[in-house]
């Protein structure tokens, strides 16, 4: 039995489940999805398929399977069972497919803001509007004094009035795409708290 391979696919995109079986004399391969029969491919190239005929092809003329126009519910376990006359038992290759959406622009919200002794302190939180899965967030802090990266969805900010302005950008990534937020300027962000030296706002 082969190892379990994790495969990522993009919504509306395609994915190929690759079989590397050059050393074996294959008679036929049976493909299943969550135990449901998908296709059988014989060595003469003849295939018998269940549904999804328009979405499943065997591109190399051999046994690897390409699945197109991916939907969210295509996520799951795929299995290739390889039958050979030269082997008593069938060989098995298993895959787990996860279909991801392309990320839209992440949204940024500001937490409670305080202004003490001319220093504006707050948190910026980055998130995807529709709560997408497996998203990794990175913050870029840009300015004359800094060019730093910060991992995680929450960025703690401490900016002193009179310092050069800073720009904050949130970058969101998932296995199939990446996107970034609108830039946020420290000066604009902190303007609300500027009038009152000890103010707090949400």
């Amino acid at each position: 039995s082969g190892t379990l391979k994790k495969v990522a696919g993009a919504l509306d995109g395609s994915v190929t489940f690759t079989l590397n079986i050059t050393e074996i004399k294959v008679d036929y391969v049976v493909w299943t999805f969550n135990t449901f029969f998908l296709a059988m491919v014989k060595k003469d190239g003849v295939t018998s398929q269940s549904s999804n005929k328009e979405r499943i092809v065997f591109p190399d003329g051999l046994y690897s399977m390409k699945l197109s126009q991916l939907k969210k519910n295509d996520s799951g376990a795929y299995r290739a069972e390889i039958y050979s006359t030269s082997s008593q038992a069938s060989l098995i290759q298993e895959y787990v497919l996860h279909v991801y959406k392309h990320l839209s622009r992440p949204k940024v919200t500001m937490g409670l803001q305080s202004n003490k002794n001319g220093t504006c302190v707050t948190n910026l939180t980055c998130c995807m509007e529709h709560g997408e899965e497996d998203v990794i967030y990175t913050w870029k802090a840009l300015g004359q004094a800094a060019n730093e990266s910060h991992n995680g969805s929450i960025l703690p900010i401490s900016w002193r009035w009179g310092e050069s302005d800073m720009t904050f950008i949130c970058v969101a990534r998932n296995p199939v795409s990446r996107n970034f937020s609108s830039p946020i300027l420290a000066r604009k962000l902190c303007e609300g708290a500027a009038d009152d030296p000890d103010s707090s706002m949400v």
């Epitope: 392309h102 720009t167 990534r173």
Partner: antibody, heavy 119, light 107 residues
């Protein structure tokens, strides 16, 4: 040292095909999005497309989508550009480029490989 | 596609001078703009990203500015080694697009 080295360029007839390669070294190739960019003689830069680390997403400039195919082999640390149905306007220097920190701007470029389309 | 227009194909300057190269986007790209330098016979080299952040090792005489649709690369105290083509690039939306380039000539 981080390096990209393109190869496979040459003279090709109109309507013909060619496959370019880009060998990467000095960094973890399997973690990076990678792009192809071309530059026609005496002209500006044109982004062709990009591929994500596991090949599940490939984005192209719309006008080139039907004639170019980008692929990669992480085991070989190599990026590919399959060109088909080439025309004289595809004559250019072809660069592969790596985005800085996986962002969208390119800090590492190869020296390029020249493709000349002529009969 | 977003069109990046560099209206000056050529710019002439003298060593020690200050020169500004402009780039105009056909629609708002925020600050998602990079600048590259390409010396004769060489590959492009990243100078500026996020409109104004200098890439590692780039001399501080190179300054990027702008947001929205209008961007500028300013070279102060121009040196003879700055003779090159300069390209802007937007990465706000697909497909990424470059300006046509500005060739800086040293008098």
């Amino acid at each position: 040292e981080v390096k990209l080295l393109e190869s496979g360029g040459g003279l090709v007839q109109p309507g013909g095909s060619l496959k370019l390669s880009c060998a990467a070294s000095g960094f973890d190739f399997s973690r990076y999005w990678m792009s192809w960019v071309r530059q026609a003689p005496g002209k500006g830069l044109e982004w062709i497309g990009e591929i994500n680390p596991d090949s599940s997403t490939i984005n192209y400039t719309p006008s080139l989508k039907d004639k170019f195919i980008i692929s990669r082999d992480n085991a070989k640390n190599t990026l590919y550009l399959q060109m088909s149905k080439v025309r004289s306007e595809d004559t250019a220097l072809y660069y592969c480029a790596r985005p800085d920190g996986n962002y969208w701007y390119f800090d590492v470029w190869g020296a390029g490989t020249t493709v000349t389309v002529s009969s | 596609d977003i069109v990046m227009t560099q209206s000056h194909k050529f710019m002439s300057t003298s060593v020690g001078d200050r020169v500004s190269i402009t780039c105009k986007a056909s629609q708002d790209v925020g600050i998602a703009v990079a600048w590259y330098q390409q010396k004769p016979g060489q590959s492009p080299k990243l100078l500026i990203y996020w409109a104004s952040t200098r890439h590692t090792g780039v001399p501080d005489r190179f300054t990027g500015s702008g947001s929205g649709t209008d961007f500028t690369l300013t070279i102060s105290n121009v040196q003879s080694e700055d003779l090159a083509d300069y390209f802007c690039q937007q990465y706000s939306s697909y497909p990424y697009t470059f300006g046509g380039g500005t060739k800086l000539e040293i008098k």
